[in-house]
Amino acid sequence: QEDEDGDYEELVLALRSEEDGLAEAPEHGTTATFHRCAKDPWRLPGTYVVVLKEETHLSQSERTARRLQAQAARRGYLTKILHVFHGLLPGFLVKMSGDLLELALKLPHVDYIEEDSSVFAQSIPWNLERITPPRYRADEYQPPDGGSLVEVYLLDTSIQSDHREIEGRVMVTDFENVPEEDGTRFHRQASKCDSHGTHLAGVVSGRDAGVAKGASMRSLRVLNCQGKGTVSGTLIGLEFIRKSQLVQPVGPLVVLLPLAGGYSRVLNAACQRLARAGVVLVTAAGNFRDDACLYSPASAPEVITVGATNAQDQPVTLGTLGTNFGRCVDLFAPGEDIIGASSDCSTCFVSQSGTSQAAAHVAGIAAMMLSAEPELTLAELRQRLIHFSAKDVINEAWFPEDQRVLTPNLVAALPPSTHGAGWQLFCRTVWSAHSGPTRMATAVARCAPDEELLSCSSFSRSGKRRGERMEAQGGKLVCRAHNAFGGEGVYAIARCCLLPQANCSVHTAPPAEASMGTRVHCHQQGHVLTGCSSHWEVEDLGTHKPPVLRPRGQPNQCVGHREASIHASCCHAPGLECKVKEHGIPAPQEQVTVACEEGWTLTGCSALPGTSHVLGAYAVDNTCVVRSRDVSTTGSTSEGAVTAVAICCRSRHLAQASQELQ
């Protein structure tokens, strides 16, 4: 009854505001779009997030909401504005009939509308607890700095903040935005309501079983007693964090999102905004044994997305499902039988499994790294997490075949020392989404805002591709790969590096007339070659018999097929030096690799020649991998010959700066 009265009251106000002439003329031109969760059971029709254009002010948001209510009322529909967003994203949350969507999409300032959907805790079995004492010696792990300068926000269930493991470490905020529990006979048992959040708080900062024992935490309740929440509730939680950050700026902030729902444009956008405000977000990849790119916030590029492995460094199986995987995962971390605080009693411990637990590990590691180096940016932190991870220890056979190459084979680890990594040139590999199979399809891979794109390569499982090129987009270089006719699609692979004070440009040579192949070099003074790309318009690049190896004494040169245009990435940065390393195999082979030596970082990876039997090239950690078609399907031996070309760089400037600090 109260609810109905509330609706009526708002409706009257809405009508009055319409009469007061607050309505504006609708904008023409751009059409707002509607989005909803691809997973039907997770949809929450009747509640919608109306996202307004970026520059929209709060007053305009409120006016647009009132206008929607007024127009809906004229059509005989009741609506209720549940929340007006500002601080992170402009917009509002509205309860209304789906019949009004067409109307709402035509309102001024509207960018897009997303139907609300569910998000879920990512632990199993988070309410079937098995109480166990900590099964380790506590003095085996006592880090020098426990993350004491960092505040970790946890968006989860309610938590038992006075549990012995976490007492005094967790401040329970007054934020709560959760849906009603399902089922009429649901019995709210306090210890079960607190289970998931208490365990994760313990994994992050617990006295005895925590990763960052010195980190202080703040908890927001966005998941109910069944571990279920909503995208809208999570959005409002993220907005709460942003407002808290503005009101009382503290040291570095880490936000742990141990939850997942279907792909959500709005949730990813909110995460992007918060990340760009200097907040480190860490999330669970999801427990659906599926591509993490199909889930949010796991699919948000600005978020550090964590998959789960077990004590043997194998991907975690969870019942019939297991950890998510794919290019949207940044790294893996322990996520099976993780011991942490149990809400069953104030001294109890329990083991839980899932990508939530894995994400909590990484949030703890991040807190420790940020406590040691509070000025680290998100890009620097992500690169360090990748750099210090255990490499190539995961058995990739567990992943679907088409996801193996895309999934990072990295298990998070604490740096041997929290200081002293500053001299390193850090790079990571970023895969694009699949282009799709159409003739002109392209795929784009992008680096983070404060990373430099140092090289660009492409890969196609069918081998039908038209190479790749680096191009400017919005003032930043991106890596674009091109599909070919009859191809099943391509991936673009960007090599993204941290290179302070870098000035990079792309030099292009069009296809050569002569038969010797195309060449391009870095001709500007002080610029060094960091990567080579080639792109061709012809459908099938023929064999390239003449030698294509780089002439001696010309390290700053890219060479390629005469029918291809060649692109050289040339960079100037203090103390940057690079060298080209090649590994050619005369006999046909499905994979050719070349690695950079200790102290050097792989910045570029390409194949010679760029003929059609080469599937592509990509960097895996410090190794350049060139893949060719199955040798049994390849024709002549000469066509089978492939050379992997690595460009290895280091920065003397970073090394000197590091020595001066020590």
């Epitope: 900590p134 506590a138 038992q160 903040s161 006075d162 006295r207 005895d208």
Partner: antibody, heavy 115, light 109 residues
């Protein structure tokens, strides 16, 4: 500032009960429980148990289990410790302290059990 | 009988350093990071001096330090001062409760 203020001294006969109070202030109560510790004259410290301000859950030491009851009154931010069937060896100073970490202590309440 | 064993007394001259040991088992001191040390002057409540093995609360002099090896924790007081004369108690978590040491009387000569 963080403070725990306890009730005054008590003299009880053997077999009786005593109820000591401890009023907490200056911090977020739900972030810590309250421990009770006693100290017999000239002796060491003995942990008696713990109670949660958050949900009222308790954890009693085996030695006093069955004779002790700890309760909270969240409206007044007060914790109570009741000890029944008093014996002469229950004569001690009873302290409340913040949480399991016991980083802040009350001033103590002397309980004398004498016939 | 206290669960944790401490020497009944130790003494030292002003300016000297002393160490008080606290021995338990793998079920208490050895199994947890949560060893605390308390100072108690006569007629006063205990005061926390060290928590979680080696951390000092704000306001506690840097002359007080804690460490742990295996099942034994230690409190070291350097540059002894007259006001350090007091009883010192260690405590540790056990799986379900808390235990204290019997206490050590520190005399500053």
């Amino acid at each position: 500032q963080v403070q725990l203020v306890q009730s005054g001294a008590e003299v009880k006969k053997p077999g009786a009960s005593v109820k000591v109070s401890c009023k907490a202030s200056g911090y977020t109560l739900t972030s810590y429980g309250i421990s009770w510790v006693r100290q017999a004259p000239g002796q060491g410290l003995e942990w008696m148990g713990w109670i949660s301000f958050y949900n009222g859950n308790t954890n009693y030491a085996q030695k006093v289990q069955g004779r002790v009851t700890m309760t909270t009154d969240t409206s007044t931010s007060t914790v109570y410790m009741e000890l029944r069937s008093l014996r002469s060896d229950d004569t001690a100073v009873y302290y409340c302290a913040r949480g399991y970490g016991m980083d802040v202590w009350g001033q103590g309440t002397t309980v004398t059990v004498s016939s | 009988q206290s669960a944790l064993t401490q020497p009944a007394s130790v003494s030292g001259s002003p300016g000297q350093s002393i160490t008080i040991s606290c021995t338990g088992t793998s079920s208490d001191v050895g199994g947890y990071n949560s060893v605390s040390w308390y100072q108690q002057h006569p007629g006063k409540p205990p005061k926390l001096m060290i928590y979680e093995v080696s951390n000092r609360p704000s306001g506690v002099s840097i002359r007080f330090s804690g460490s742990k090896s295996g099942n034994t924790a230690s409190l070291t007081i350097s540059g002894l001062q007259a006001e350090d004369e007091a009883d010192y108690f260690c405590s540790s978590y056990t799986s379900t409760s808390m235990v204290f040491g019997g206490g050590t009387k520190l005399t500053v000569l």
